[in-house]
């Protein structure tokens, strides 16, 4: 039975409906009672929708699929997928069985356009020729990952000193932040183009910088040079201080904490009042210490997503700012060791030893060694998967040929905390079972 689907992927915008076309040629006298139709995910074989015994068996895929029942008898087995999500992207197989059987797979390519980029400058005041400035271009809620291009006001590409990061949100849509560092000339235009490669959609913005002479007497803002390291779930203090002049009063103070890259507001103090947290209600100032020049920020119940740079802006009559980095960490659990096969082991057997350690951050370094401390680097495969909280589970697999006996040790290191967690397994020469039976 010949089943026909489009060769090219079906491109669908997030939130819209998509039709995955599939057709077959019914023979004369064909009736729907003879038809078995199954749509499933090609890779996982998960059932999506089916028609059997003359009846639509309904959606097995979040109630977002439908057939075209009036068209089935003419050989139209297409599937309608509603409110498309990023997670729907992939291959769907259409199985048709009458007397004979046929199948074909159709690809769904999900897309979402990127927003017009917003451009921010750091520093954004008192710029002079020769200053180094960081220009950030941010575009949101697109899919798939964007391509980003920078150029100057004459169309000359700017490829040096560009750092682009793309982060997916819970829906799988990407926010792109591209940072260009330039040394200012007399004046200049800087343009950022964000392209969606599937939609061939361009979003662009530009900024023109005209440096000028800056006034003297900027506020000196001090933060620690080294990153602040905080354990997940604990509280962290991001220190920031300034030197108040005699006669300084809090009514003169404008204090703003924001995320350095995205410029998202975190916390502010203006017009003599704490304006509160704009960051999930997990931040606080030290109000009793502000008058002495302590503008530090308390961040509670630290999460992996908090990691990054926070900028402390202080404005009294003059203005100053400085950025402090928050490095988040979480210790790794003591590794568990498993063997495969784990019974009747003999010298000469190939055995797979798996070392698993959980819920650490950032990604671990994994080292294997034998009972004499000799490193084992061949035949090691290590994978690290982040959970919803961003914490990593690490699984490292060592394949070895057993000797007469041997000890195999796995060390999982957290590179930020310099914390080591290790496990080992000893395999003896005679036939044995692991773990040893009581």
């Amino acid at each position: 039975l010949e089943v026909q689907v489009p060769e090219d992927p079906v491109v669908a915008l997030v939130g819209t409906d998509a039709t995955l076309c599939c057709s077959f040629s019914p023979e004369p006298g064909f009736s729907l009672a003879q038809l078995n139709l199954i749509w499933q995910l090609t890779d996982t074989k998960q059932l999506v929708h089916s028609f059997a015994e003359g009846q639509d068996q309904g959606s097995a895929y979040a109630n977002r699929t439908a057939l075209f029942p009036d068209l089935l008898a003419q050989g139209n087995a297409s599937l309608r997928l509603q409110r498309v999500r990023v997670a729907d992207e992939g291959s769907f197989t259409c199985f048709v069985s009458i007397r004979d059987f046929g199948s074909a797979a159709v690809s769904l390519q999900v897309a979402a356009p990127y927003s017009k980029p917003s451009m921010t400058l750091e520093p954004n005041k008192d710029l002079r020729p020769g200053d180094t400035v960081t220009i950030t271009c941010s575009s949101y809620q697109g899919y798939p990952e964007a391509e980003v291009f920078w150029q100057d006001g004459q169309g000359v590409p700017l490829t040096g000193n560009v750092t682009t990061s793309q982060m997916a949100n819970e829906q799988g849509l990407f926010d792109v932040h591209s940072i260009l560092r330039v040394v200012l000339g007399a004046n200049g235009t800087y343009s950022c183009l964000v392209r969606n490669p599937v939609l061939q959609q361009d979003a662009h913005s530009s900024v023109t910088i005209t440096p000028q002479r800056s006034p003297t007497g900027a506020v000196e803002v001090q933060v620690p040079e080294d990153p602040v390291v905080a354990l997940v779930g604990t509280d962290a203090t991001l220190r920031c201080s300034f030197s108040p002049e005699p006669g300084f009063s809090l009514a003169q103070l404008n204090l703003i904490w924001q995320l350095t890259d995205t410029k998202q507001l975190v916390h502010s103090f203006t017009e003599g009042r704490d304006q509160g947290s704009a960051y999930a209600n997990r931040t606080a100032l030290f109000p009793d210490l502000l008058a002495q020049g302590n503008a530090s920020l308390r961040l509670q119940r630290v999460r992996v997503a908090d990691e990054g740079s926070f900028t402390c802006f202080v404005s009294i009559r003059d203005f100053g700012s400085a950025a402090v980095s928050l490095q988040v960490a979480a210790p790794y659990s003591k590794p568990s060791m498993t063997l495969e096969p784990n019974k009747d082991l003999r010298p000469g057997d190939t055995v797979t030893i798996t070392c698993s350690s959980y819920r650490g951050y950032p990604e671990a370094e994994v080292f294997w060694q034998d009972g004499q401390g000799v490193p084992l680097t061949g035949n090691v495969t290590t994978s690290q998967m982040a959970n919803e909280q961003g914490l990593f589970d690490v699984h490292s697999v060592l394949r070895v040929v057993l000797g007469a006996n041997g000890t195999y040790s796995c060390l999982v290191r957290n590179p930020v905390l310099q914390q080591d967690a290790h496990g080992s397994v000893t395999i003896t020469g005679q036939p044995m079972t692991f773990p040893p039976e009581a």
Epitope: F149, Q151, G153, Q154, G155, P157, T159, S191, Q200
Partner: antibody, heavy 121, light 106 residues
């Protein structure tokens, strides 16, 4: 109208130098970059480099960096390209072109008629 | 550097035929430009910013994009279209041209 007028053909011996010109008219010379493109007989187009007449910044294709110098004279709205240590490989037509457009899309909208350089002993 | 590969090198067509030539970039480009050149003449701007026709270019010319491949199509070839067509990018240094596709009329 916008024009780029290039200097006459040059006949030179191997090892010699030539300096050709590209005079702009009909627009603000300092507002756009001027690029130079090489085309050998029966061959395709090769980018040599560009000059920004306003800042006098230049950038070159590495392939041509050592044998080429680009300059511009704002008072006469003229761009120049000097080729040194000529070899037979330098026999070609050399075009100047204006890179124009608006952010972020640019292209060569105006081309000179080309200067033919023949290197022969 | 970004290499632009044009195919075919030579394209032969009869008047009224539909023809397509392709320019494939070795990596993503911000946009592509196309130029037409006839023997003994300077190149002329033909298509800019991937798909925009330059002034005076007939509407029978169009461009489609798939990944890093840019395809220039002439819906009905006319005698005046006989020329060499070059693609060009400047997303990163150096600026590069394709080797060209020569369109000949039968």
């Amino acid at each position: 109208q916008v024009q780029l007028q290039q200097s006459a053909a040059e006949l030179a011996r191997p090892g010699a130098s030539v300096k050709m010109s590209c005079k702009a008219s009909g627009y603000s010379f300092t507002s756009y970059t001027i690029h130079w493109v090489k085309q050998r007989p029966g061959q395709g187009l090769e980018w040599i480099g560009y000059i920004n007449p306003n800042s006098r910044n230049t950038d070159y294709n590495q392939k041509f960096k050592d044998e080429t110098t680009l300059t511009a004279d704002r008072s006469s709205s003229t761009a120049y390209m000097q080729l040194i240590s000529l070899t037979s490989e330098d026999s070609a037509v050399y075009y100047c072109a204006r890179y124009s457009g608006s952010t972020p899309y640019w292209y060569f909208d105006v081309w000179g008629a080309g200067t033919t350089v023949t290197v022969s002993s | 550097q970004i290499v632009l590969t044009q195919s075919p090198a030579i394209l032969s067509a009869s008047p009224g035929e539909k023809v397509t030539m392709t320019c494939r970039a070795s990596s993503s480009v911000s946009y592509m430009n196309w130029y037409q050149q006839k023997p003994g003449s300077s190149p002329k701007p033909w298509i800019y910013a991937t798909s925009n026709l330059a002034s005076g270019v007939p509407a029978r010319f169009s461009v489609s994009v798939s990944g890093t491949s840019h395809s220039l199509t002439i819906s009905r070839v006319e005698a005046e279209d006989a020329a060499t067509y070059y693609c060009q990018q400047w997303s990163s240094n150096p600026l590069t041209f394709g080797a060209g596709t020569k369109l000949e009329l039968k």
